[in-house]
Interface confidence: medium
């Protein structure tokens, strides 16, 4: 018995086709990815194979205006459209809290919503009751295919789930769940969830009976043969695990942002062990039309967008000063609100020892595109922000040793003066540099705000010392020459979209007042 | 193949309730939306509501006051209660599902064959 | 509701011949608009969607066109088993509504 399963991770409200670098869409004729262009290749697999299962590896919330807007509605509705079997609910799920999980998608969500490792208890766990599920036995065919969902154990420090969900540990949730399965008399059975590759890996190897993974988070590309565009393969697709009890078990993620659809075509026995497994995830090329249905609801949509975007979010009474002559060479007052407004997304998880779980910030100087003049009525729009930060990155959290973000601020200042991207602007950072030494030894003083203790105060970097920092995905990528940061990270979560985090500080604070403080010198 | 099969009393009195069950087989009720449709003898045809898999549903305003449509997916069937009947409800009543090809439940295809219900008493 | 208005009510064609049948829908639907061919004792049957999409398993010499607030079903040469009651259906908003009817006659 052969299963279709294709399967999307880490959407991130790509609902429109996007460049090829999943950016805005320019140039239409190269374009890729949407919903509508989507819904072609699924209708079009649905048509010509039997057993089809269509699965979401969780976060389709946050990465563009379209969720700014519409909070999850969007992607209810879209993927109702398009008749997703299932979904696994990602970190990015709990952004605007349970509440904002709870109304737009699981309440209006057509498919199961599913993730065994997440827990309520107190008051929700009667409110959310039977809104996600941990398994969902499927009928596919004249077989029946059970689906057993995980989300990150890490959401609480990425998210905001609040503190009536507990989240455990993958393995130890999911095992008892497929034991449940096999008593059903399921003996298919597909792990779909969002915890990153390395964890796929480990339920393939450490679940007994889970036949499929698949998998999201850590936007990997898998591809078996030449890839068609300019993401590079992490290993072949599927990936093949051994687990300990001696399966072959396939594991599979489809990269990120709607780019390609994942396809993976798995033979069963008639005792649902896997025979053999192969496929590749589907570039969603401009090759691929877009279906003229969903487009024309997507631009019915769209204009809501457009309305939005010239909404003032707040006011500025200083002028905030992005311009390259400032913020490649000093310390600018657009880059200190920019990293003040990327700590402030990112509290949360306090204790009795932390005030927070995170205090620093890193932005490259080249990333910020343009000023914001106060003289406007001091009012701030989305428009002004992307004019901001035009590339639809996302900040991300990342923990690095003290040793390699000393590496990354003597990068930032190795070539001053000529005007290049890699200068850093900060945040719970007090830098000094001096640029009378020669590059790779100008650092002189590297003082970085403590989180546990009480009373924030600035401590002198230490080497050995894992820290978190906040920092854009650009630059958690290796991108302006940090290299560093990308060879010597020790973990990567992708969070939320740039402008996004801006807006909410701007809209939070409603005046803003921005001032060099130095922080660098 | 998906079928669907109408089944219920062909005659009811006028003032009682009208009930229909629609049983689907060849493939699960969980994953679409399901609709009933009339046709009165020589006339056109009328949605009634749908339900989908999982229980939401949606009436035609005109007969929402008197319609409830449920679901029982251990039996694989949906159901159909039109209350306080005339002889105006007399109609063949077919149920059906969405087309495949329709993101929305925008069509239809499969319908059952079709029952027809005479109101009289 | 959207009221869904075809046109003629009954047209009677000879084997062979082409036949148009119009819908037109009191507000746009853009392309939202099925058609299907009913036989006397029979359920309807699905024949094209989203205005022009010929659903599988459906002859090619049928075949539909329209947008907004026209739209047209075509058969192109008209067969034996084409005789019988067309009836348009608009899928934008719900409720969904259908159109009165074409019955095809031999004529």
């Known amino acids: 018995w052969e299963l279709t399963i294709l399967h999307t991770n880490d959407v991130h409200s790509r609902l429109e086709q996007t460049s090829e670098d999943s950016s805005k869409c320019v140039n239409a004729s190269r374009c890729m990815g949407g919903v509508a262009r989507l819904f072609t290749k699924v209708q079009q697999i649905r048509r010509a194979e039997p057993n089809v299962l269509l699965l979401d590896a969780g976060d389709q919330y946050q990465g563009t205006i379209w969720f700014t807007v519409y909070k999850g509605a969007e992607v209810a509705h879209f993927m109702n459209a398009l008749r997703y079997d299932a979904m696994a609910l990602g970190n990015h799920e709990f952004d605007n809290g349970v509440e904002g999980l709870i109304e737009p998608l699981l309440k209006e969500a057509k498919f199961p919503i599913l993730s065994a490792n997440i827990k309520a208890k107190g008051p929700l766990a009667s409110q959310i009751s039977g809104l996600y599920l941990p398994y969902k036995v499927l009928p596919v065919g004249d077989e029946v295919v059970g689906i057993v969902g995980y989300t990150s154990k890490e959401t609480p420090f990425l998210s905001n789930p609040g503190t009536n969900l507990v989240f455990e540990d993958e393995i130890t949730a999911l095992q008892p769940e497929v034991d449940k399965l096999k008593t059903l008399n399921v003996n298919k059975i597909i792990a779909l969830g969002h915890s990153g590759f390395e964890t796929d890996k480990l339920i393939a190897q450490k679940v007994r009976g889970v036949d499929v993974v698949v998998g999201g988070h850590s936007n990997t590309f898998l591809y078996t043969g030449n890839p068609p565009s300019k993401e590079v393969p992490a290993g072949k697709y599927p990936f093949i695990v051994t687990s300990d009890d001696g399966r072959k078990v396939p594991v599979v993620q489809a990269y990120a942002f709607g780019k390609y659809l994942g396809y993976l075509k798995i033979e069963f026995d008639e005792r649902g062990n896997v025979i053999s497994s192969h496929g590749n995830p589907i570039l969603l090329n401009s090759s691929i039309p877009e279906d003229p249905s969903i487009k024309a609801d997507i631009n019915k949509w769209r204009i809501k967008l457009d309305n939005y975007s010239t909404q003032e979010l707040g006011k500025t009474i200083v002028y905030l000063d992005g311009s390259s002559q400032s913020c490649r060479f000093r310390e600018c007052n657009m880059g200190n609100l920019i990293c003040d407004a990327m700590i402030n997304n990112n509290l949360r998880h306090a204790d009795e020892m932390f005030w927070n779980h995170v205090s620093m910030c890193i932005l490259n100087g080249g990333g910020i595109r343009s000023p914001i003049d106060e003289r406007n009525n001091g009012t701030i729009t989305w428009e002004n922000l992307a004019a901001v930060l035009p590339f639809g990155g996302t900040f991300d959290l990342v923990q690095l040793k003290g040793s390699t973000l000393k590496k990354a601020f003597e990068h930032s200042v190795h070539r001053y003066g000529q005007s290049t991207g890699e200068f850093l602007q900060v945040g719970g950072i007090h830098v000094v540099y001096d640029l009378s030494r020669k590059p790779g030894d100008r650092v002189v003083k590297l003082d970085v705000l403590c989180t546990k203790c009480r009373v924030p105060s600035y401590d002198p970097l230490k080497m050995d010392e894992i820290y978190k920092v906040i920092l854009p995905n650009f630059l958690a990528n290796g991108g302006d020459g940090f290299q560093m940061i990308k060879d010597e990270l020790l973990r990567h979560d992708s969070g939320d979209q740039d402008i996004n985090v801006v807006s909410t500080y701007i809209s939070k604070m409603k005046v803003i007042y921005p001032a060099v403080e130095g922080r660098i010198k | 193949q998906v079928q669907l099969q109408e089944s219920g009393p062909g005659l009811v009195k006028p003032s009682e309730t009208l009930s229909l069950t629609c049983t689907v087989s060849g493939g699960s009720i969980e994953r679409y939306y399901w609709s009933w449709i009339r046709q009165p003898p020589g006339k056109g045809l009328e949605w009634i509501g749908y339900?989908?898999?999982?229980?939401?549903?949606n009436y035609n305003p005109s007969l929402k006051s008197r319609v409830t449509i449920s679901v029982d997916t251990s039996k694989n069937q949906f159901s159909l209660k039109l209350s306080s009947v005339t002889a105006a409800d007399t109609a063949v009543y077919y149920c059906?599902?969405?087309?495949?090809?329709?993101?929305?439940?925008?069509?239809?295809?499969?319908w059952g064959q079709g029952t027809l219900v005479t109101v009289s008493s | 509701d959207i009221q869904m208005t075809q046109s003629p009510s009954s047209v009677s064609a000879s084997v062979g011949d082409r036949v148009t049948i119009t819908c037109r829908a009191s507000?746009?639907?853009?392309?939202?608009l099925a058609w299907y061919q009913q036989k006397p004792g029979k359920a309807p049957k699905l024949l094209i969607y989203a205005a022009s999409s010929l659903q599988s398993g459906v002859p090619s010499r049928f075949s539909g066109s329209g947008s907004g607030t026209d739209f047209t079903l075509t058969i192109s040469s008209l067969q034996p088993e084409d005789f019988a009651t067309y009836y348009c259906?608009?899928?934008?908003?719900?409720?969904?509504?259908f159109g009165g009817g074409t019955k095809v006659e031999i004529k």
């Open positions: 259906q608009q899928g934008n908003s719900f409720p969904r509504t």
């Open positions: 339900i989908y898999g999982r229980g939401s549903t």
């Open positions: 507000q746009g639907i853009s392309s939202w």
């Open positions: 059906a599902r969405e087309s495949q090809e329709s993101p929305y439940n925008n069509w239809f295809d499969p």
